[in-house]
């Protein structure tokens, strides 16, 4: 059996103010079945970042065509950077449990810190 | 080509069991969610079961008596099935199921369907 | 559960006619929504998912719509080999799937 791994490649990711930041994530399995969402920091204070199922994230759009069959690639972009917006990142799986998903497994994370402003 | 075949149909008297199976092929089973879907003689569709690796849901009409399972390796999907009754009688397809966008299942491929028919 | 009510029960329809069948849901299910066709003594065929994408294959004769509660699957110029009947299925909110009663297209 395919063990599902979540793919986060970039460990650092520095952004400038005002710019658009791109969070890659990818996985190795459909399964389990249930959504991946989008988190930053951990824990239970953590602050959802992205639900395509249900929510509104104005700043947030998916890399991949939303009507894709059989996606594998959850990567996100984030627009409009503010240093509000530093902190580690995480994609996660969640396995379809009813009536409440329950994490399955979470990516290793990518950390967002503010770069140089351009010259 | 992706093909879904069914077999393990027949007659069985209330009570009995029953084992149904889905061989599989043309796409990587594994990594894929499969499905159970019945439909009675002249009636509509009715989904069963479905599996994903290790996780297993169920209509509430066969939970309890019906059991999905998988064999990766012989790229197999199975159903058990145990204390029948008449209105289990049905078609029972296979389906390979397929996600959209983050998340959603529907079904994109269908066997042909094996025939159960539960008669004292 | 989500209950999905599929009207006209049947459809007497001529080839080369525009047919539109209609799929209501008792809940918001956003786009979650399939289409598939069924011929007698036939398994069913996927046509069209996420309310309006079609499947690999399927003629642009078929065409989905809505979001929401109220979904329509046409056919802007039924052809004879679209004789057979037509069901909608939920996949927003699940175990379980739901599918809707069908819709019967017979030859007027």
């Known amino acids: 059996e395919e063990e599902l791994q979540m793919i986060q490649p970039e460990k650092l990711l520095l952004v400038t103010v005002g710019k658009t930041a791109t969070l890659h994530c990818t996985v190795t399995s459909l399964l389990p079945v249930g959504p991946v969402l989008w988190f930053r920091g951990v824990g239970p204070g953590r602050e959802l970042i992205y639900n395509q199922k249900e929510g509104h994230f104005p700043r947030v759009t998916t890399v991949s065509d939303l009507t894709k069959r059989n996606n594998m690639d959850f990567s996100i972009r984030i627009s409009s950077i503010t240093p509000a917006d530093v902190g580690t990142y995480y994609c996660v799986k969640f396995r379809k449990g009813s009536p409440e998903n329950v994490e399955f497994k979470s990516g290793p994370g990518t950390e967002m810190a503010l770069g140089a402003k351009p010259s | 080509e992706v093909q879904l075949v069914e077999s393990g149909g027949g007659v069985v008297q209330p009570g009995g069991s029953l084992r149904l199976s889905c061989a599989a092929s043309?796409?990587?089973?594994?990594?894929?969610?499969v499905s159970w879907v019945r439909q009675a003689p002249g009636k509509g569709l009715e989904w069963v079961s479905t599996i994903g690796a290790d996780d297993t849901y169920y209509a509430d009409s066969v939970k309890g008596r019906f059991t999905i399972s998988r064999d990766n390796s012989k790229n197999t999907l199975y159903l058990q099935m145990n204390s029948l009754r008449a209105e289990d009688t049905a078609v029972y397809y296979c389906?390979?199921?397929?996600?959209?966008?983050?998340?959603?299942?529907?079904?994109?491929?269908w066997g042909q369907g094996t025939l159960v028919t539960v008669s004292s | 559960e989500i209950v999905l009510t599929q009207s006209p029960a049947t459809l007497s329809v001529s080839p080369g006619e525009r047919v539109t069948f209609s799929c209501r849901a008792s809940?918001?299910?956003?786009?979650?929504i399939a289409w598939y066709q069924q011929k007698p003594g036939q398994a069913p065929r996927l046509l069209i998912y996420?309310?309006?994408s079609r499947d690999t294959g399927i003629p642009d004769r078929f065409s989905g719509s809505g979001s929401g509660t109220d979904f329509t699957l046409t056919i802007s110029s039924l052809q004879s080999e679209d004789f057979g009947v037509y069901y909608c299925?939920?996949?927003?909110?699940?175990?379980?799937?739901?599918f809707g009663g069908g819709t019967k297209v017979e030859i007027k």
């Open positions: 043309g796409f990587s089973f594994s990594i894929y969610a």
């Open positions: 809940q918001n299910v956003r786009s979650d």
């Open positions: 389906a390979k199921d397929s996600t959209v966008g983050w998340s959603g299942d529907f079904f994109d491929y």
């Open positions: 996420a309310a309006s």
């Open positions: 299925q939920q996949y927003y909110d699940w175990p379980p799937f739901t």
